[in-house]
Each structure stands twice: as C-alpha cells, then as structure tokens.
C-alpha cells in the first residue's frame, strides 16, 4: 500500500510524513510585499495585517485504508493534513555573509490539528482470521495556534477570537501532560 502507517502509544495510526500530498501552489494575494503599500518591505508589526489569508491553515485532505500488520480496514477513511503558513515567515539573516536564517524569539504560530474525530473501523485480516474492531483518531480540522517560547511547550494558544469560546461537547483536557509527549504530538502534526 502507498500509505504505510505506524502506531504510537496512543494507538493512533498516523501516515508517514513523507507520504503527505503535495500542497497546492502558494496563494498569490500576499499584500504585505506590495510595493505601493509597503515600499517592498514587510510592515513593522508582522502580525498587524488585514490579510486574513496569511493566518489561515491549509486543510489538505487525503484518503487511505487503515492498516495494522496484514489487516486492513473494510472501508477507507479520509482525514486532513494541516499545512501552510500561519502569518508572515519573520525570518531574518543571522549574520552578514553567513547565509543562515533564524526566527526571532517571541510567539511561534503553527498550523496544527485542532479537532479530531474518533472513528471505529473494522479490520479484515487474511487467512480466515476473525475481523476486529479498532478505534482511530482522525484529524477533522486545523487551526493556527500560538506556541509561546516563554511558557511550557505544552501551552498551545489558539490564534484569533475563537480562543475564548469553549467547544461544545468537549471535556477539558487534563493539564498534566508532559511537555515531551506534547512535543511528539506536534512533530507528528506537520
């Protein structure tokens, strides 16, 4: 199968990063570099821009069968890959002539999974083995979230006004998750 998968300790089945579909061409309505408006330079405050498209995640979808060893789901599933820039790149030259780049300290905006959907799938196995049920967690939506360097890694902040709104039907997550576990989840996300 083209979509190999591995299991992590949360028993999610996550496609290999190398198998993600190619993102579509970059959006062409980036106004921050418009010479008439900004003299060809980015504005002083990179996050004070009216162009909402700069802050949106791209939600690319893909289709796959869930596999577990030789077993494969009876029905395929579809989920999202979170992609795209959350705000201007804010990359500055590190040193003259070095050609290296660095990101200034401050809020780091990432396009990561926002909402998951738990889905029960039936796995069919070869050799007359009985089918077995399995629950998988599929990415259902993406969001730009702010990762503040000065706070614990696990403190991901929602970007935009939606942060204040509690989500319906969702229990508050225990805060005691280790930063290490959370970092692994972030790395899986993009």
């Amino acid at each position: 199968q083209g979509w190999q998968a591995f299991k992590n300790d949360a028993t999610e089945i996550i496609p290999e990063l190398g198998e993600y579909p190619e993102p579509p061409p970059e959006l062409e309505n980036n106004k921050t570099m418009n010479r008439a408006e900004n003299g060809g330079r980015p504005p002083h405050h990179p996050f004070e821009t009216k162009d909402v498209s700069e802050y949106s995640c791209r939600e690319l979808h893909f289709t796959r069968y869930v596999t577990d060893g030789p077993c494969r789901s009876a029905k395929p599933v579809t989920e999202l890959v979170c992609s795209g820039q959350c705000g201007p790149a804010r990359l500055l030259p590190n040193a003259i002539g070095r050609g290296k780049w660095w990101r200034p300290s401050g809020p780091d905006f990432r396009c990561i999974p926002d909402r998951y959907r738990a889905q029960r799938v039936q796995l069919l196995c070869p050799g007359g083995e009985a089918p077995r049920a399995r629950k998988v967690r599929l990415v259902a939506s993406c969001k730009c979230k702010r990762l503040t360097r000065f706070h614990n890694q696990s403190e991901l902040k929602d970007f935009g006004t939606e942060a204040a709104r509690p989500q319906k039907g969702r229990k508050p997550r225990p805060r005691a998750r280790s930063a290490k576990a959370n970092q692994a989840e972030l790395e899986n996300a993009y």
């Epitope: 289709t63 789901s73 395929p76 599933v77 579809t78 989920e79 259902a140």
Partner: nanobody
Amino acid sequence: EVQLVESGGGLVQAGGSLRLSCAASGRTFSRDVMGWFRQAPGKVREEVGSIKWSDANTYYADSVKGRFTISRDNAKNTMYLQMNSLKPEDTGVYYCAAAIIGGTYNDWGQGTQVTVSS
C-alpha cells in the same frame, strides 16, 4: 444517506482516455469528500483519488498521479474522473464514495466497469 450513481465506463484501448461521472443525490450536504476507488479482479479495492467538496482540493494515489484528474460540478452535484494514458492495469470496477472529513466512506455507488485492452 447519499445515493451515488457512476457512469461512463466501457472498453478502451491502452493509451486511450475515458471520463467517469458520479452523480450524488439525497443528503448531499452530509458529505465533505467524494472519492474514486477501483477493484481489479482478484484484488482488494484501492483508492484512486478524492476531492474535497468545499474547495476542490484533490488527492491522488501514486499509481494514477499525472494521468487521472478528479473534478466536480457543484451545480450538478457530480464528480468526474478524467482518465488519460490508460494502461491494462487500470482495468477494474470503479466506484465512487462519499465521506465526512475524519470519517469512513460509508456511502458507495454500484460501480462501473472499465476495461483497458492491450
């Protein structure tokens, strides 16, 4: 439930083209994504590609990239599969299916036969 009906299958020579259609009716608002799948004789059903209805973002399996194109017509509630440079290994029954994002493809059409002769 979404009702799906495929059409456009047939016999074609290797290197030829074919265009399949999948017309959706019923609770079409309950689907985010529509996909094409195929099943060759004696093989398991495999994904061909899919399209996200809201923004027409497409996904293709490696085996068909560059040869097959998926599109949709909102007004007609129809998805298309344009198949070019067909190969004998593209032979099989082609199915269309619908799903919500983060879920399984629960609604399926009856399928249309595509045969590519060498």
